[in-house]
Amino acid sequence: ELCDDDPPEIPHATFKAMAYKEGTMLNCECKRGFRRIKSGSLYMLCTGNSSHSSWDNQCQCTSSATRNTTKQVTPQPEEQKERKTTEMQSPMQPVDQASLPGHCREPPPWENEATERIYHFVVGQMVYYQCVQGYRALHRGPAESVCKMTHGKTRWTQPQLICTGEMETSQFPGEEKPQASPEGRPESETSCLVTTTDFQIQTEMAATMETSIFTTEYQ
């Protein structure tokens, strides 16, 4: 049920999970100069019942100075198969995340945690993409990727997000940029393409909220 690969990368975009499906593993990694405690867990595991999901095991790091080594803890070879590295995340959550049944929230940081987190995702996991600072969405089709099982193999769907650093792009004559949300898309998805002032104010707020979801999760 583990996904064989990492989610696809999109040029000039980052992704993150808003919640983690039961079965997801998070490696217990320590920052340089620290190591897992002797009897410590190798990973945290998202587990749960029908009403509540939470992370099993706790990651604990201790100073490795006593062993006269500064070797950083890395996953064992068997752990490396489904690794996904993300930047370190803070415990702040989007408000709706905890209510997703069968999913765990972002685990809070542990003392002396490494600066990157390595997740092992499971089938059904969804991750969301957005353009990095300085880039905007030229085209925002489905901006998420789902790990699916097909013909006995796992595969992440390809997000249809194109991020561009080009500020001046053409638009076809006589056509105004969207004023409302066509085809039921959230308004925030049109924010970086809108030219009308009133709507821009709304969408900038929405875009700010959208961005804050990303920035509060990732330090």
Epitope: L138, Q160, E166, P178, L193
Partner: antibody
């Protein structure tokens, strides 16, 4: 099933303009950007530009900036490429291709520019 | 603009052979690379995307590898229908440029 169907072959005189179409079916048209690519006889593939089928925003290869115009009509799920001031070097097969990874292509439109 | 250079430009091989085509980018493009197959008079067909992911419906004898600037398309055992021209292309940034193509011919 996913299909991109392009308009028929065109013969044009130098200096004229041309508009070719690419109609998408079998998927949600506005979910995927549309690229335009051309191939001169016996040559390789040349990227012309990409248009967001959702917003109409477009980016062109520098070579085509000002001479090519990509548009979309969401109501008919059709993308268009217009090329003005045609010259003999524009003789080529023009393709539309879907999405980030160009996973589906139109059958191609043969354009001949000749006096 | 990013230049994509394929080698060889043409290649003669026999059915059953293992064939490798390489593509080099003029700068780091991470894994934002596709491989296409084109037969005479037909539109290109996507084989591999994101450097190594096999497109739907493509036989498993095709595989892609590489990251950064150097990429490889491998056909493990050539079939008669594989004789065609192959193109690499990046989608790192606009303009999305293609390699000049590799023509695979029957020996």
């Amino acid at each position: 099933q996913v299909q991109l169907v392009q308009s028929g072959a065109e013969v044009k005189k130098p200096g004229a303009s041309l508009k070719i179409s690419c109609k998408g079916s079998g998927y949600t048209f506005t979910d995927y950007a549309m690229h335009w690519v051309r191939q001169a006889p016996g040559q390789g593939l040349e990227w012309i530009g990409v248009i967001s089928t959702y917003s109409g925003d477009a980016i062109y290869a520098q070579k085509f900036q000002g001479r090519a115009t990509m548009t979309v009509d969401k109501s008919t799920s059709t993308a268009y490429l217009e090329l003005s001031s045609l010259r003999s070097e524009d003789t080529a097969v023009y393709y539309c291709a879907r999405g980030v990874t160009f996973d589906y292509w139109g059958q191609g439109t043969t354009v001949t520019v000749s006096s | 603009d990013i230049q994509m250079t394929q080698s060889p430009s043409s290649l003669s091989a026999s059915v059953g052979d293992r064939v490798t085509i390489t593509c080099r980018a003029s700068q780091d493009i991470s894994n934002y690379l596709e491989w296409y197959q084109q037969k005479p008079g037909k539109a290109p067909k996507l084989l591999i995307y994101n450097a190594k992911t096999l497109a739907e419906g493509v036989p498993s004898r095709f595989s892609g590898s590489g990251s950064g600037t150097d990429f490889t398309l491998t056909i493990s055992s050539l079939q008669p229908e594989d004789f065609a021209t192959y193109y690499c292309q990046h989608h790192y940034d606009t303009p999305y440029t293609f390699g000049q193509g590799t023509k695979l011919e029957i020996k």
